[in-house]
């Protein structure tokens, strides 16, 4: 019996089934839906998590204005195709042979087409803007305390290297967290900003992906930080390719998470 066999669970992903039949007799945890073995010492990729979810038995301005190329996930949930490493395949298709291209966080970045649609490469999302509105409080949070707490959260809970949290902006009641991670910056073993953002999004919604941990209890100097709305913008290293109709109308059609 190895220690892993005595406690064969996945701390970082509750949407797994674990058994002591991995290499070397170690505990091996498979993601629901795909059956792929996941590394339970770090975050599971968003693609495998989405697949598991679909298979399982929602004045001087300091705030960032998302660029014209920012993407919002308007398409909601879908059952994605993941590559052998668990990343999103560049081209996604549904059961009716409608296909589209996605970025590294699985968000559609082209108009929908048919099976002839080509997606040459998986385009990296290098900048994520998490836009939050917190519930009314007695007073505004201290910006530096808020900044420190959110950076601690991403470092300790999601194991994201601090250098990838580019900035925390605050203009009551809006908080913005900027995550930046270029292809060249991401070393082997680094948590992907897209995965960290997805875990954070699920935590904020009260749908924690962590095994057995309590939900997210965010506090700034003891004061609860309760989020009532989140909006996440994704910026890719190569701008998306939508028709003009989409750019003028669809861009502002946001999904709000309550």
């Amino acid at each position: 019996h190895t220690a892993a066999q005595d406690n064969c669970t996945c701390p970082t992903n509750k949407m797994t089934v674990c058994s002591p039949d991995g290499p070397g007799g170690r505990c091996q945890c498979r993601a629901l839906g795909s059956g792929m073995a996941v590394d339970c010492s770090t975050l599971t990729s968003k693609c495998l998590l989405l697949k598991a979810r679909m298979s399982a038995p929602k004045n001087a301005r300091t705030l960032v204005r998302p660029s014209e190329h920012a993407l919002v996930d308007n398409d909601g949930l879908y059952d994605p195709d993941c590559d052998p490493e668990g990343r999103f395949k560049a081209r996604q298709c549904n059961q009716t042979s409608v296909c589209w291209c996605v970025n590294s966080v699985g968000v559609r970045r082209t108009d929908k087409g048919d099976l002839s649609l080509r997606c040459d490469e998986l385009v990296r999302t290098h900048h994520i803007l998490i836009d939050l509105r917190h519930r009314p409080t007695a007073g505004a949070f201290n910006h530096s305390d808020l900044d420190a707490e959110l950076r601690r959260l991403f470092r300790e809970r999601y194991r994201l290297h601090p250098k990838f949290v580019a900035a925390v902006h605050y203009e009551q009641p809006t908080i913005q967290i900027e995550l930046r991670q270029n292809t060249s910056q991401k070393a082997a073993g680094d948590v992907d900003i897209g995965d960290a953002a997805y875990y954070f999004e699920r935590d904020i919604k009260g749908e924690s992906l962590f095994q057995g941990r309590g939900g997210l209890d965010l506090r700034v100097r003891g004061e609860p930080l309760q989020v009532e709305r989140t909006l996440i913008y994704y910026l890719d290293e190569i701008p998306p390719k939508f028709s003009m109709k989409r750019l003028t109308h669809h861009h502002h059609h946001h999904h709000h998470h309550h």
Partner: antibody, heavy 115, light 107 residues
């Protein structure tokens, strides 16, 4: 020692259903996957699906999703597979096997579908 | 699904010779490949797990190698009882699949 013992041979008519059992012993039944594999006469091995007895989470080969049902009774350490709407090409030896690398196999259950 | 292609389909060798059986996966599966021997009328028997891990009770003449997409089962010196059908199987992701088999026959 680990053993998987399967139920006996079955002869069924087309359109009928068959249920094969696999009784496990010699290990903790709930901690390992049980897989079902079949082999038609003179053919290779075909994976039907797998069940995790601890929580009865089951995964099916797309080919069998509409006709196969895998279950597990933890109280008697036994896994089952039921195949419905049988056809003549379902004639095969059905095996249960343990773990992701199929380290232990049942002796096989011959299912013959014939009118 | 991941397709496993075994070669050759049939291998004719004599006792004492070295046998090399190949299994190729349609995509990268790391080391999630396992090898089985099956004799007529019997259930398959696990020989090698995770590409190269040996199995208790299996003679040391059986060894495995490879990672990614190309895998090899080697029998260093064939014994009369080794003539059988050999299958590879992957456990990378669902659905699990088997190769079509290599029949090892006496020359």
């Amino acid at each position: 020692q680990v053993q998987l013992v399967q139920s006996g041979a079955e002869v069924k008519k087309p359109g009928a259903s068959v249920k094969v059992s696999c009784k496990a012993s010699g290990y903790t039944f709930t901690t390992h996957w049980i897989h079902w594999v079949r082999q038609a006469p003179g053919q290779g091995l075909e994976w039907i699906g797998t069940i995790f007895p601890s929580n009865a989470y089951a995964v099916y080969n797309q080919k069998f999703r509409d006709r196969a049902t895998m279950t597990a009774d933890r109280s008697i350490s036994t896994a089952y597979i039921e195949l419905s709407r049988l056809r003549s090409d379902d004639t095969a030896v059905y095996y249960c096997a343990r773990a992701s690398y199929f380290d232990y196999w049942g002796q096989g259950t011959t299912v013959t579908v014939s009118s | 699904e991941i397709v496993l292609t075994q070669s050759p389909a049939t291998l004719s060798l004599s006792p004492g010779e070295r046998a090399t059986l190949s299994c190729r996966a349609s995509q990268n599966i790391g080391t999630s490949i396992h090898w089985f021997q099956q004799k007529p009328g019997g259930a398959p028997r696990l020989l090698i797990k995770y590409a190269s891990e040996s199995i208790s009770g299996i003679p040391s003449r059986f060894s495995g190698s490879g990672s990614g997409t190309d895998f090899t089962l080697t029998i260093s010196s064939l014994e009369p009882e080794d003539f059988a059908v050999y299958y590879c199987q992957h456990s990378h992701s669902w659905p699990f699949t088997f190769g079509q088999g290599t029949k090892l026959e006496i020359k």
